[in-house]
């Protein structure tokens, strides 16, 4: 349409820009492998790397695994987004006693107020129920059946979450971990168990602090101990260790008290897209066939991409490109165009850069 022409002409001759007829503006064309953060990018900072599914781009521009909320006692609060992790919280009826980055290392059931006490503040995902003495004139013989189950000798302002002790199974609060199905489903409706010598789950100045060995008075060797599969990061927070559960990953170093598990690509594969303590995408070592060529592209990021040879050229099989990562080979007849979800595909010409996904299918490198 003629009215578009004057605007469109202003973009011509500048390969780094294009004219969007819909918004009638010149827009910056993000380099290959980077993706726009707005509909009409204006500058290079409007283009970012796109991570694999279940990874997000952290502040340092690294693809980092989103935490998982797969434990029985956790629910997803916010989903994994391109630039922020999934956030997990304790499921309804439970509160977090030991927090972790974007998650909770240990959840307990909300306590039930004992006889003579009523709920002052109901429990939330972050806080336990807070109890207060029943108002004068309200019979301790139960203002509400929820708040009065059995007689109690003392009154406490805060209901204590108490774990099941070996001798009893009537406890109201119990830490729940991933492997255990919630046997205490109805426990939040029960009364608390008699105080036991165990300190686990008791309110303290720092729930989650527990000595790594018996802690003598004045000893400096009492450090915070995280739940299994969590480690203590540099900031002193319990952080989930990465998982190596993907088919193409193996554990390189285990999850320790002060360091994450690290994963690496299983034998026969090489990391094409790195991630913190892991690899976001593993690709098979190349098997150089007569009709393929491996060639690193000059890209804005370190990921290696590969292209099929121009027709009629002799292959030049180079198993270790400049960045030291071995590329995957691709067949020119199998080039596919896909997004980062690698689901439905469109063919692309043989000059388009492709890599192999962890499923072995050719995938156009999305960073």
């Amino acid at each position: 349409f003629p009215q578009d022409r004057p605007f469109e002409d202003t973009c011509h001759g500048n390969p780094s820009h294009y004219y969007d007829k819909a918004v009638r503006r010149c827009c910056y064309r993000c380099p290959m492998g980077l993706f726009p953060t707005q509909q009409c990018p204006q500058r290079p900072t409007d283009c970012r790397k796109q991570c694999e599914p279940d990874y997000y781009l952290d502040e340092a521009d690294r693809c980092t695994a989103c935490v998982t909320c797969s434990r029985d006692d956790l629910v997803e609060k916010t989903p994994c987004a391109w630039n922020s992790s999934r956030v997990c919280e304790c499921r309804p009826g439970m509160f977090c006693s030991t927090s972790a980055v974007n998650s909770c290392a240990r959840c307990f059931f909300h306590s039930v107020c004992p006889a003579g006490m009523i709920v002052k503040f109901p429990g939330t995902a972050q806080k336990n129920t807070v109890c207060e003495p029943a108002s004068p004139g309200v019979s301790p013989a139960c203002a509400s059946p929820e708040n009065c189950k059995e007689p109690s000798s003392g009154t406490i302002p805060q209901a204590k979450p108490t774990p099941v002790s070996p001798a009893t199974s009537s406890a109201s609060t119990m830490p729940v971990r991933g492997g255990t199905r919630l046997a205490q489903e109805a426990a939040s409706k029960l009364t608390r168990a008699p105080d036991s010598p165990s300190s686990v789950g008791r309110p303290s100045s720092d729930p989650g602090l527990s000595p790594t060995q018996p802690c003598p008075e004045g000893s400096g060797d009492c450090r915070k101990q995280c739940e299994p599969d969590y480690y203590l990061d540099e900031a002193g927070r319990c952080t989930a260790c990465v998982s190596c559960s993907r088919d193409d990953l193996v554990e390189k170093t285990p999850c320790a008290w002060n360091s994450s598990r690290t994963c690496e690509c299983r034998p026969g594969m090489i990391c094409a897209t790195s991630a913190t303590n892991s690899c976001a995408r593993c690709v098979p070592y190349p098997i150089c066939a007569a009709e393929t060529v491996t060639k690193p592209q000059d890209m804005a990021e370190k990921d290696t991409t590969f292209e099929a040879p121009p027709l009629g050229t002799q292959p030049d099989c180079n198993p270790t490109p400049e960045n030291g990562e071995a590329p995957a080979s691709t067949s020119p007849t199998q080039s596919l165009l896909v997004d980062s979800q690698a689901s439905k595909t469109l063919p692309i010409p043989t000059s388009a850069p492709v890599a192999l996904s962890s499923t072995g299918k050719p995938v156009l490198d999305a960073g």
Partner: nanobody, 123 residues
Framework: QVKLVESGGGSVQAGGSLRLSCAAS????????MGWFRQAPGKEREWVAR????????YYADSVKGRFTISQDNAKNTVYLQMNSLRPEDTAMYDC????????????????WGQGTQVTVSS
Amino acid sequence: QVKLVESGGGSVQAGGSLRLSCAASGYIYSSNCMGWFRQAPGKEREWVARIHTGSGSTYYADSVKGRFTISQDNAKNTVYLQMNSLRPEDTAMYDCAAGRVVLGAVVCTNEYWGQGTQVTVSS
């Protein structure tokens, strides 16, 4: 160089159907979108529909929802717009556009455009 070629336009009676095609050649980015816009004489260009070619997710303007269907043929690198129950107000030049999904959004860039195909619906 990316090239988009539209076809399938023509004249049709109100209530009739047409199927537009947009064939893409040359390099197309991954995580991409292909979509249709239309512009009637003297009016603003209007977005009609788009498909995220990787996931297959489809989106439509309210004015065409339930009447138009966008689809793709992976083998032919082609996107189609099936237009049913056409109305006189659907008369316009239909343009195909291609670009990339915007991170964290369902909108797309429109980096490449075809030359357009005319659709005329008479009452």
